[in-house]
């Protein structure tokens, strides 16, 4: 039975040209995290594999940085970056847990962040 839950940064906004940290946290399970995928709708952005470490998709290498932790930093944001992002935790023995974050990239300088939390 899957007992874990994923907390995410929820709905967030950021300014065009700026940076944002996408963060998820898996709790309430003792399952081993074998891999975390970061995906944007139909694209794979990056993977953190327990054995192989971080790998960034070539098309995002210039604008995506690994971390902090299992999170992902998006840089040089454009309005086209607006949309859904998914953290997909592959765990053993539980299976797969998915978290969703909606990012809105704003033209104006009034970019208000959604609920944030500290990752220990």
């Amino acid at each position: 039975m899957m007992t874990g839950t994923i907390e995410t940064t929820g709905n967030i906004s950021a300014e065009k040209g700026g940076s944002i940290i996408l963060q998820c946290h898996l709790s309430s399970t003792t399952a081993q995290v074998t891999q975390v995928n970061w995906e944007q709708q139909d694209q794979l952005l990056a993977i953190c594999n327990a054995d192989l470490g971080w790998h960034i998709s070539p098309s995002f290498k210039d604008r995506v940085a690994p971390g902090p932790g299992l999170g992902l930093t998006l840089q040089s944001l454009t309005v086209n970056d607006t949309g859904e992002y998914f953290c997909i935790y592959h765990t053993y023995p539980d299976g797969t847990y998915t978290g969703r974050i909606f990012l809105e990239v704003l033209e104006s300088s009034v970019a208000e962040h959604g609920a944030r939390f500290q990752i220990p």
């Epitope: 891999q35 995928n37 694209q43 794979l44 998709s57 997909i88 053993y92 023995p93 539980d94 299976g95």
Partner: antibody, heavy 122, light 110 residues
């Protein structure tokens, strides 16, 4: 349309090698792992190994280690399996199959090629 | 010899339900949720029907369902139809030994 197109049937002599190809289309090739599964006539499915182009990571089932080479060419979106030291019991249909999920976790396969029949006979 | 044991054959009449079992051990099926089921018609490639014990890929009929109890996973097909006649394979995945398939079950629709 997402599909995997495999190379044609082969007839090989015992002791020789065979190389089967699997060309992917309709998706980002590097993002998904490709596994190779074979099926001898009238028998069940047998996982041989797989490759994750995203990492260039290759896993081969213990039974086939030393005899199987799995490669991928990202420029042509093609995966290959080469099986050496062929024997009659290697006669089978060889399938390539794409991982259900991106990143090469390899727990389930949602897209399959039509299979390539390899016959090993003297 | 497969590490996963399936009945060689099962049968049922149209409209009925049938269940195919897949028995492993406490170190494979009993210890994780990475169990999948495939359908294979003669001369065709396998088709994924269930993954992670009970999840259906898009496009698969909701007449197919998966479950697990202890070391045994099960595939249930309800409202049996003629086109369900095929071979069915379970599989178990572990990060160390990757994918192992059951020997397959032939489903006959009477």
């Amino acid at each position: 349309e997402v599909q995997l197109v495999q190379s044609g049937a082969e007839v090989k002599k015992p002791g020789s090698s065979v190389k089967v190809s699997c060309k992917a289309s309709g998706y980002t090739f590097a993002s998904y792992g490709i596994s190779w599964v074979r099926q001898a006539p009238g028998q069940g499915l047998e996982w041989m190994g797989g490759i994750t182009p995203f990492f260039n990571r290759v896993d081969v089932a213990e039974k086939f280690q030393g005899r199987v080479t799995i490669t991928a060419d990202k420029s042509t979106s093609t995966a290959y399996i080469e099986l050496s030291s062929l024997r009659s019991e290697d006669t089978a249909v060889y399938y390539c199959a794409r991982d259900l999920r991106r990143g090469g976790v390899g727990d389930a396969f949602d897209i399959w090629g039509r299979g390539t029949l390899v016959t090993v006979s003297s | 010899q497969s590490a996963l044991t399936q009945p060689r054959s099962v049968s049922g009449s149209p409209g009925q339900s049938v269940t195919i079992s897949c028995t492993g051990t406490s170190s494979d099926v009993g210890s994780h949720n990475y169990v999948s089921w495939y359908q294979q018609h003669p001369g065709k490639a396998p088709k994924l029907m269930i993954y992670e014990v009970s999840y259906r890929p898009s496009g698969v009929s909701n007449r197919f369902s998966g479950s697990k109890s202890g070391n045994t996973a099960s595939l249930t097909i309800s409202g049996l139809q003629a086109e369900d006649e095929a071979d069915y394979y379970c599989s178990s995945y572990t990060p160390s030994s990757a994918t192992v398939f059951g020997a397959g079950t032939k489903l006959t629709v009477l």
